[in-house]
């Protein structure tokens, strides 16, 4: 498997419609919680919680502040922490508690605290519970949490120094935690937690399970340096701890190694960055997508592996355990345990079989089972990815977060669309296409290239968005920018399962699964653009330039996978001559303009898709070069800003089916005024201008017209 290619399209922040939310002097918007039924997005930031309209996050509905007192700040600073940054209250837990309240925890100047937020009044109840074990002390420390039936399961550090890791359940009747022992947790960096509900039709009275994902220092591999290992661990929701052994400790805590590697190249991805659990009506068992980087990542490598949850469950239910053995100089080595395994199976949830044997609760489990799981929390078998290889490996990028959406293309094929954020504020959208990865697009979510700290996907049909949180704010982006593809070819070549070309409206439209009639829409996930209707017209942009100047003709080909070439009249231009130059690989520069340069210029693009090359005419320009005797006083000119040039004449364009959108204005770099020529007729056409173009000093003038294209294939 090769490295993933560059994104086909790069959308700059200003090019697409992104909705933003940020409040002055508020930072670290890292906790996001979506209430789909209320269309509300809850945002936990530093010292504040906000409620915003999930359909338009710039609309703030409520806000509440949870600041640290000066006294607490001072005490924190005395312990050597920064008063300006660390000794504040970073919201780290934002979980639903009931229909009317949220459970919120913050670092609270290194004295973690939790409270209940009433959603009606949007005020804290002032419970000020101790957040130890639920929320980290240090805002820089890792954490994860999930609320399951009113009980908070969390993975974080339990002390000021962050040296005691803990996976715990905060419960009034049965609080549980991990053993503070290296075999259980060895300097973990917590990434994600989620509950997997038992299957409703499960015959064996199974229990719900809570899964934790983290990276920790390996106990089983000993090298000169510390080897990091990605882990999946799970506990049973019904666990009540042991009666004597493992009292108030998990009796069901088991962990296994997650494998994500490229065997052919020896590339091992062993640092877990994020996890997303994909649940879909078509999936019997959830699939989880995990995002990794290698431990020594000097080249910026990232990988995504996908796993069937059943594979992990198989390891925990039937896999071999590891055990530690002491070798010379009291050195501990972990090896596969091949001895007898007590019954009931250590670490197993209480199911019908256990109940039939009179083990109705973990409190009834025999000491042998409990002692075994206490000493053998690590499985020898590893959890391997689907197809035994990564779904995606990308070079020169550090991915930070992942969300995945399962969607159906027009032909019924199901695609898992991966939305992966980067440490430079961008979002990549990728799919697997015929055993290769296609990165549909890259969107610059944050203008100042800051890391994306959290990603959230809305699952409501119709209005679908991705929400991204960073240090400076939250950005809301649609799942696709279909409308930005101006031609049928562009729409098809995007190979975006969310988009299809609508011939009646000559637009690229978003496919919403709820809207049924898709008749007549064109979508070819193979990228075969020959299915597109022939273009009968193409718009020409006309320009008048001063003799001796320089012209830049725009070619607005957005695809990073396309190459362009230019034609003048019937000849193909090479931009390596003294006469021509290429600007940004796409735009044509024509130097030292003379009358001989007047005529029709076309920019054609070629894009290879699966050993097929798609050619299309992207831009057409009619250039008229005039010798200017003297300046002319110009009437008032309507001026608009256009991307790519500072000023341009305003031109009204009637769009034609399948035609390229008019390219942005071409700006003359020569100085001097321009006289209006007498009704120019562009080469090869009798089409005359229908509008009068005003002229202004320092600017060439232009207009748009339509010419029949005789040789489109």
């Amino acid at each position: 498997m090769a490295f993933a290619p560059i994104p086909r399209i790069t959308w700059e922040h200003r090019e697409v419609h992104l909705v933003q939310f940020h409040e002055p002097d508020i930072y670290n918007y890292s906790a996001l919680l979506l209430s789909e039924d209320k269309d509300t997005l809850y945002i936990g930031a530093r010292e504040a919680v906000f409620a915003v309209n999930a359909l338009n996050i710039s609309e703030k509905q409520h806000e509440v502040y949870w600041k640290v007192s000066e006294d607490k700040k001072a005490k924190c600073a005395e312990k050597g922490k920064s008063k300006q940054t660390e000794c504040l209250n970073y919201i780290r837990v934002l979980q639903p508690l009931s229909a009317t309240s949220l459970y919120v925890c913050g670092t609270n100047a290194f004295q973690p605290a939790c409270d209940h937020l009433n959603l009606t009044s949007f005020k804290f109840l002032g419970k000020n519970e101790d957040g130890k074990g639920r929320c980290p002390f240090d805002p820089a420390h890792s954490y994860t949490s999930v609320m399951v039936d009113g009980e908070l399961y969390s993975g974080t550090s339990y002390n000021f120094l962050g040296s005691e890791p803990i996976i715990s359940r905060n419960s009034s009747h049965s609080p549980l935690r991990t053993e503070y022992a290296i075999p259980w947790l060895n300097e973990p960096s917590f990434v994600f937690a989620d509950v997997i509900r038992k299957s409703p039709d499960s015959p064996d009275g199974e229990d719900d399970r809570v899964y934790f994902f983290f990276t920790e220092v390996s106990v089983e591999y000993e090298f000169v340096f510390r080897v990091l290992i990605p882990r999946i661990a799970r506990v049973c929701k019904g666990d009540q701890g042991g009666l004597r052994t493992l009292q108030k400790k998990w009796t069901s805590f088991l962990k296994a190694r997650l494998i994500c590697s490229r065997p052919d190249s020896g590339l091992v991805f062993n640092v877990l960055r994020d996890v997303f659990v994909l649940r879909s009506p078509g999936l019997k068992v959830p699939v989880f997508y995990a995002l990794f980087t290698p431990q020594l990542n000097n080249v910026g490598l990232s990988a995504v592996c996908a796993y069937n949850l059943s594979t992990a469950e198989e390891v925990f239910s039937h896999g071999k355990y590891m055990q530690s053995t002491t070798v010379e100089q009291s050195h501990t080595k972990w090896v596969r345990y091949n001895g007898p395994v007590p019954k009931p199976r250590p670490g197993a949830c209480i199911d019908s079989e256990a109940r039939a044997a009179n083990y109705t609760s973990s409190l009834n489990l025999p000491d042998k089972t409990l002692q075994f799981v206490k000493d053998h929390p690590l499985m020898d078998d590893s959890v391997t990815p689907i197809d035994n290889r990564p779904r995606l490996i990308k070079k020169d990028v550090n991915y930070t977060q992942i969300v995945v959406d399962r969607t159906q293309a027009l032909d019924g094929t199901v695609y898992d669309v991966m939305f992966v954020s980067t440490d430079r504020g961008a979002l990549h959208k990728a799919i697997s296409l015929e055993h290769a990865v296609h990165i549909i697009e890259e969107t610059q979510l944050f203008q100042d290239f800051e890391p994306v700290q959290t990603l959230l996907l809305s699952s409501k049909k119709g209005n679908r968005f991705v929400y991204a949180g960073s240090n400076s704010g939250v950005v809301q982006a649609p799942l696709a920018f279909c409308g930005k593809h101006g031609t049928c070819e562009d729409c098809v070549l995007a190979r975006d399962p969310y988009c299809a070309w609508s011939p009646p409206t000559a637009t690229c439209v978003a496919l919403h699964q709820t809207e049924s009639p898709s008749r007549g829409l064109i979508q070819e996930m193979s990228g075969d653009a020959s299915v597109c209707p022939d273009k009968s017209k193409g718009s020409y942009r006309q320009h008048f330039f001063k003799h001796g100047g320089t012209a830049e003709l725009k070619c607005s080909q957005k695809s990073n996978l396309a190459r362009v070439f230019w034609k003048f009249q019937n000849g193909v231009l090479k931009a390596e001559s003294p006469k021509y130059g290429l600007m940004g690989r796409k735009n044509l520069l024509i130097f030292n303009l003379s009358e001989g340069d007047s005529g029709v210029y076309q920019c054609l693009s070629e894009e290879r898709v699966k050993n097929k090359t798609v050619f299309q005419v992207v831009a057409k320009h009619v250039l008229e070069v005039k010798v200017v005797p003297k300046p002319v006083v110009a009437p008032t000119l309507s001026v608009v800003q256009t991307e790519g040039s500072r000023i341009a004449t305003k031109v009204l364009v009637a769009s034609t089916q399948g035609s390229s959108p008019p390219t942005p204005a071409v700006q003359a770099t020569s100085s001097g005024a321009i006289t209006l020529p007498p009704k120019p007729a562009p080469t090869g056409t009798s089409c005359e201008p229908k509008i009068v173009i005003n002229t202004v000093p320092q600017l060439h003038s232009e207009k748009t017209m339509y010419l029949k294209s005789s040789d489109n294939r």
């Epitope: 090769a2 490295f3 290619p5 560059i6 990073n560 996978l561 190459r563 362009v564 070439f565 034609k567 019937n570 000849g571 193909v572 090479k574 690989r585 076309q602 054609l604 070629e606 290879r608 050993n611 097929k612 090359t613 050619f615 299309q616 005419v617 294209s709 005789s710 040789d711 489109n712 294939r713």
Partner: antibody, heavy 119, light 111 residues
Framework: EVQLQQSGPVLVKPGASVKISCKAS????????MNWVKQSHGKSLEWIGD????????SYNQKFKGKATLTVDRSSSTAYMEFRSLTSEDSAVYYC????????????WGQGTSVTVSS | DIVLTQSPASLAVSLGQRATISCRAS??????????MHWYQQKPGQPPKLLIY???NLESGVPARFSGSGSETDFTLNIHTVEEEDAATYFC?????????FGGGTKVEIK
């Protein structure tokens, strides 16, 4: 001045593999595809495939799929072609040639690398 | 694959005379008015050299006595007044689809 400098001639045994290099200079390496072309003694030219150095995308002639592997090292502006499981049929001169677009043709060629497969 | 058939296979021309080489494609190599056919010259022990690109465009540094024409499936390379140094094998090549293919070559000898 644009130059494509290929590695020297090689003599290999049947079943072995060979890796030919093509070092580009005088232009921006990532702006042009690199093509590889085979010319058997006294015969015409056969296109093996090409690679886009910008993103590593490759396209192969079906006839050479599984036989040839094209790679690039952007840091040294060098393109490589590895030929595996060599037989006497693979004895030929192999050229690298750049192209800036399908409309431009292959405007600069390496001097060629002679590969002889013999036991 | 697109098959390119060159004719004649060899050609003997007198100095100063005109030489015409034909190349026929098994399917059209033209799109949007662009004809994706190129011509190369190869001398013994040397790599091919690009003469004409996109059917009729003279490559920089190539003498003006070389010209190309044609569209769709039929293309021609002309050497208007043959010189001694033009003795070589000439190949046509299409780039409208993969695999790129070459003609069988035409050997030009000077009489």
């Amino acid at each position: 001045e644009v130059q494509l400098q290929q590695s020297g001639p090689v003599l290999v045994k049947p079943g072995a593999s060979v890796k030919i290099s093509c070092k580009a200079s005088g232009y921006t390496f990532t702006d042009y595809y690199m093509n590889w072309v085979k010319q058997s003694h006294g015969k015409s030219l056969e296109w093996i495939g090409d690679i886009n150095p910008d993103n590593g995308f490759t396209s192969y002639n079906q006839k050479f799929k599984g036989k040839a592997t094209l790679t690039v090292d952007r840091s040294s502006s060098t393109a490589y072609m590895e030929f595996r499981s060599l037989t006497s049929e693979d004895s030929a001169v192999y050229y690298c040639a750049r192209d800036g677009s399908s409309a431009y043709g292959m405007d600069y060629w390496g001097q060629g690398t002679s590969v002889t497969v013999s036991s | 694959d697109i098959v390119l058939t060159q004719s004649p296979a060899s050609l003997a021309v007198s100095l100063g005379q005109r030489a015409t080489i034909s190349c026929r494609a098994s399917e059209s190599v033209s799109i949007h008015g662009t004809h994706l056919m190129h011509w190369y010259q190869q001398k013994p022990g040397q790599p091919p050299k690009l003469l004409i690109y996109a059917a009729s465009n003279l490559e920089s540094g190539v003498p003006a006595r070389f010209s190309g024409s044609g569209s769709e499936t039929d293309f021609t390379l002309n050497i208007h007044t043959v010189e001694e140094e033009d003795a070589a094998t000439y190949f046509c090549q299409q780039s409208i689809e993969e695999p790129r293919t070459f003609g069988g070559g035409t050997k030009v000898e000077i009489k």
